[in-house]
């Protein structure tokens, strides 16, 4: 198939980093500066992405691959290929239209991005709250109240001792 294609289309011989120049008898011409072609046989090159402003260059553009951007400190990437930079907040906060706001009581955020999420409701699993939640941390659920009834131990019992003469399982 490749051989048939190259017989039909001389442009298929043009490698990445070039374009097939229709104005010059379909010769392979190098991509102009600040442009690239990542695949062979292209009729034009593509403009390199510019990492400006809040974006910074993670990988320079080359004749065969686009530039890659990330975000300056204090911001994080959003979207495919870091198409947007969003402001970081502190742990215990979330980003709103009015900037970073503390998490409401009963919610937490343990990251510098994302939204405040409700504390885990321990009682839904029949458990009790072992450690209270904060703006930065979720609650820690402990054993269920039934496990803490008189006579019951919250400590895991030791493994039974092996009888003499028995080899390990």
């Amino acid at each position: 198939f490749e051989r048939t294609r190259s017989l039909q289309d001389p442009c298929s011989n043009c490698p990445a980093g070039t374009f097939c120049d229709n104005n010059r008898n379909q010769i392979c011409s190098p991509c102009p500066p600040n442009s690239f072609s990542s695949a062979g046989g292209q009729r034009t090159c593509d403009i390199c992405r510019q990492c400006k402003g809040v974006f910074r260059t993670r990988k320079e553009c080359s004749s065969t691959s686009n530039a890659e951007c990330d975000c300056t400190p204090g911001f994080h990437c959003l979207g495919a290929g870091c198409s947007m930079c969003e402001q970081d907040c502190k742990q215990g906060q979330e980003l709103t239209k009015k900037g970073c706001k503390d998490c409401c009581f009963g919610t937490f955020n343990d990251q510098k991005r994302g939204i405040c999420r409700p504390w885990t409701n321990c009682s839904l699993d029949g458990k009790s709250v072992l450690v209270n939640g904060t703006k930065e941390r979720d609650v820690v659920c402990g054993p269920s109240p039934a496990d803490l009834s008189p006579g019951a131990s919250s400590v895991t019992p030791p493994a039974p001792a092996r009888e003499p003469g028995h080899s390990p399982q």
Epitope: N23, S29, R43, C45, D46, I47
Partner: nanobody
């Protein structure tokens, strides 16, 4: 009609200097991304230098950095390439080129002149 006329080439000894000129007509150099490409004997075209983003930045191939300087005279609508510390591997035909941005987002380039021959030899 867009025309680009190169001049200033010649035979020069290694370590010598030349200044290439490109007189443009049919378009305004200062409003375009323009530069120089070259073709060495038996080789493909190679970008040498360019003025990009309407003069906002310059580009130089690694092989010519620190030796070649691109500039333009907007009043004369002329592009220049000052070449110094010339080497045998700089021997090529040099063409003035204009970067073309297509409506669909693609990029190519156009060079209309006959080029100017630069030969570096002792």
């Amino acid at each position: 009609e867009v025309q680009l006329l190169e001049s200033g080439g010649g035979l020069v000894q290694p370590g010598g200097s030349l200044r290439l000129s490109c007189a443009a007509s049919g378009f305004t150099l200062s409003a375009e991304d323009v530069g120089w490409v070259r073709q060495a004997p038996g080789k493909g075209l190679e970008w040498v230098s360019a003025i990009l983003d309407f003069g906002g930045s310059t580009y130089y191939a690694e092989s010519v950095k620190g030796r070649f300087t691109i500039s333009r005279d907007n009043a004369k609508n002329t592009l220049y390439l000052q070449m110094s510390s010339l080497r045998a591997e700089d021997t090529a035909v040099y063409y003035c080129a204009r970067v073309v941005y297509h409506a669909g987002g693609g990029v190519t380039f156009d060079y209309r002149g006959q080029g100017t021959q630069v030969t570096v030899s002792s």
